[in-house]
């Protein structure tokens, strides 16, 4: 049986338009092969009327089009100005007419009861505006103008020139009479509802000499665009509703049962708790278009989404809308990574961020999701050597371990660091992941002095105490800079006495700076790692001052005078302009994630079982 699907029977009336959607499996071959609409002949052939390669038969010239939507696995044939001659048997298909995959469609066009030959058909999208034009003759110029809707057998008055408005149309309809030169009046209906569809009659005058015009109004609900994304990945909904709603509140909602649509996010500041930390509504353009990015996709995110505009910030009858059907592919190419990482005040975390391994040269970014208003994700660090000023000395993005994963290390943690962070690149926008950092009770595992002052020309030794739990880890000292942390030689001084209940496996590893120069001033980290996987780190700021008295300096833990929550950043540190990610592909001078390709998965991207994978700060 053919895998192509469409409607078997299509019925319409003369003058109308039809939109026939044919579905095909969206394989790579099918997406790119020829699509066609042909009419079956009596002897079995099928004459092409229109195809995706640009051919249009003379019978269809100016009244038909075929549009392929490869990402959805659909193509749509629109045929306008139908006549009874269009009745017949057709095929929609892929490939070659005689041998391709196809589906049989029967089209029947009738005159239709109650539709007069002069009926004008108006086909308008839900929530939009229609203008019904009604001509009249000079003798009726001064007479009452009216519009009726046919309800069952009876015409019901909708609006007239004496000021009457049917309650169903209050606040969204007007009757305009053109200037004296034009024998025409118009009825404009805004915020069209599905219930507005039907047959209308406009009339000038009330006697036997009145002028009448029939109209058939079709209100179309948007066909949902099919979107397939990977579990743990991200999706972007681009919503373009038109400039007429540029100043109206926008929303994205998810349909639950029937016509209910629960707000996911809107421009009035509402956000569904399930999307905390992993959603951004990007500011709208002047034309009213906007986009919503959701990261850390879960199985339960699958469903039908609508974006729209309404002053209430939620779906109401008459809201212009766009629709998507989101499918979440559980056979994801995006590897599982912890969605929660825990650290202690004064301690550190090392976050592993996945990226598309085919894009190893892409720029990597890490941003902090902020929930205020519509959500934003200001950039904190990138792989090109930029670090936000407030994070200097305590944040580093490392390309290691590579091959599809990079590492972000954040130390000197405070309670203010708790929150949702996004990993992203300027490449594949689907590979945006979110991690939540939680600050828990406890003490940092690595012990270093707080502030250290070195003297020009002298030797400085800075200790770092590693508990026995890190006995099997590689221990290192490095000097932090914007591009990473450059390893420095260090000395193992034997077991540490800084830990109670810790045996000979604890370690004191010192950093020695000989003949200190001004260039030695800065941040130094001690840390642990296993191969290319980083664990905990601790940071020390070394200040350099003029010689006061001779001798070398050996710093002990007792001199650690900075509280965990204190920032020991020197006011002289240069400020890098505030950078926040706009779509990392579009960065202009601002690094702010806009389309942002930035979404953060907040609430824990659930991983299969539904329980979040957690990662402690003390090991990878």
């Amino acid at each position: 049986k053919s895998p192509i699907f469409g409607p078997e029977e299509v019925n319409s009336v003369e003058g109308n338009s039809v939109s026939i959607t044919c579905y095909y499996p969206p394989t790579s071959v099918n997406r790119h092969t020829r699509k066609y609409w042909c009419r079956q002949g009596a002897r079995g052939g099928c004459i092409t009327l229109i195809s995706s390669e640009g051919y249009v038969s003379s019978k269809y010239a100016g009244r038909a089009n075929l549009t392929n939507f490869p990402e959805n696995g659909t193509f749509v044939v629109n045929i306008a100005q139908l006549s009874q001659d269009d009745s017949g048997r057709y095929k929609c298909g892929l490939g070659i007419n005689s041998r391709g995959l196809s589906f049989d469609v029967s089209l029947e066009v009738s005159q239709g009861p109650g539709l007069l030959n002069d009926t004008k058909v108006y086909t308008v999208d839900l929530g939009r505006t229609v203008t019904i034009n009604c001509p009249f003759k000079t003798e009726n110029a001064q007479k009452r103008k009216s519009l009726y809707k046919q309800i069952g057998l009876y015409p019901v008055l909708v609006i007239d020139s004496s000021g009457y408005v049917n309650p169903n149309y209050t606040g969204r309809i007007r009757l305009d009479i053109q200037g004296t030169g034009q024998l025409l009046f118009s009825v404009v209906i805004n915020q069209l509802r599905l219930s507005d569809a039907g047959q209308y009659l406009c009339q000038a005058g009330d006697d036997s000499n009145s002028n009448k015009k029939n109209a058939d109004l079709q209100v179309l609900k948007p066909e949902p665009e099919l979107v397939y994304e990977d579990l743990r990945g991200s999706v972007t909904f681009h919503c373009a509703l038109g400039p007429e709603v540029a100043n109206v509140a926008k929303f994205l909602c998810r349909q639950s049962s029937g016509e209910n649509c629960d707000v996911v996010v809107n421009t009035l500041g509402k956000r569904a708790p399930a999307f905390e930390g992993r959603i951004l509504l990007n500011p709208q353009d002047k034309d009213g278009s906007f986009s919503v990015v959701i990261t850390g996709l879960r199985k339960e995110d699958a469903g039908r989404y609508l974006c729209g505009a309404h002053s209430d910030g939620q779906l109401q009858e008459g809201s212009p809308i766009q629709a998507w059907q989101l499918f979440v592919n559980e056979e994801s190419t995006i590897p599982r990574s912890p969605t929660v990482v825990k650290g202690v005040a004064g301690g550190s975390v090392a976050v592993l961020c996945p990226y598309n391994r085919k894009e190893s040269k892409s720029i990597k970014y890490w941003c902090l999701w902020e929930g205020a208003q519509n959500g934003r994700c200001p950039l904190l660090v990138d792989s090109e050597g930029w670090v936000k000023a407030q994070y200097e000395g305590r944040l580093s993005l490392l390309e290691e371990p590579g091959n599809g994963t990079f590492t972000v290390i954040l130390n000197q943690l405070t309670s203010r660091d708790a929150g949702f962070y996004w990993c992203l690149t300027n490449g594949d926008t689907l590979w945006r992941t979110t991690v939540e950092i939680k600050i828990i009770e406890g003490e940092p595992n690595l012990k270093v002095p707080g502030n250290v002052t070195a003297v020009l020309g002298e030797t400085l030794k800075v200790p770092c105490h590693f508990p026995c739990k890190f006995s099997s880890y590689e221990k290192y000292w490095c000097k932090w800079n914007n591009t990473g942390c450059q390893a420095l030689p260090s000395q193992d001084e034997g077991p540490s006495k800084a830990f109670v209940n810790c045996d000979e496996n604890s370690r004191l590893v010192s950093l020695t700076l000989n003949l200190v120069t001004r260039a030695d001033e800065g941040w130094y980290w001690c840390g642990v790692k296993q191969g290319h996987f980083y664990g905990e780190t601790a940071a020390v700021y070394v200040a350099v001052e003029e010689r006061k008295a001779a001798g070398s300096r050996d710093v002990s833990l007792a001199k650690a005078d900075a509280a965990p929550d204190e920032k020991v950043l020197d006011s002289g540190f240069r400020e890098i302009e505030n950078k926040a990610i706009q779509d990392p592909r579009l960065f202009a001078e601002e690094k702010a994630v806009a389309d942002t390709r930035d979404q953060a998965d907040g609430s824990r991207a659930s991983v299969d079982s539904g329980s979040s994978e957690e990662q402690g700060g003390s090991s990878r």
Epitope: F5, G6, P7, E8, E9, V10, N11, S12, V13, N16, V18, S19, I20, T21, Y23, G112, L115, L126, L194, S195, A197, G198, Q199, D216, L217, Q218, V219, L220, K221, P222, E223, P224, Q255, S257, G258, E259, R304, A323
Partner: nanobody, 129 residues
């Protein structure tokens, strides 16, 4: 909340006819996909007919191969009701018949996820030979 109420089921002899009705509330039958499905004891639910109408004068429909030429789906937009006219009934048509509604256009694929539909409680059709 979508509510679909089926009626018109019953027992008839093979070769007879029945007309099922489905009164919908909470969803307009135009501009949405309406369908009839059936489930015989011990069998999986299967599609019978689908209908998508954009106006009082335009509609698109499909019928399952097993009922083609015998069953016809139709609608009355004013009453927000969908019908299934069943002629030349056979014993194998015996089943519980369900009316279903899905937001938006029909996908025309009988295997298309049934979890996207809202369902009525069903009406029983029994055909004796």
């Amino acid at each position: 909340e979508v509510q679909l109420v089926e009626s018109g089921g019953g027992s008839v002899q093979a070769g007879g006819s029945l007309r099922l009705s489905c009164a919908a509330s909470g969803i307009t039958i135009s501009n949405n996909c309406m369908g009839w499905f059936r489930q015989a004891p011990g069998k999986e639910r299967e599609g019978v007919a689908l209908l998508y109408s954009t106006s009082s004068t335009s509609s698109q429909k499909s019928h399952a191969d097993s009922v083609k030429g015998r069953f016809t789906i139709s609608r009355d937009n004013a009453k927000n009701t969908v019908y299934l006219q069943m002629n030349s009934l056979k014993p194998e048509d015996s089943a519980m018949y369900y009316c279903a509604a899905k937001s938006g256009v029909c996908r025309w694929n009988w295997e298309y996820g049934m979890d996207y539909w809202d369902w009525g409680k069903g009406t029983l059709v029994t055909i004796s030979s």
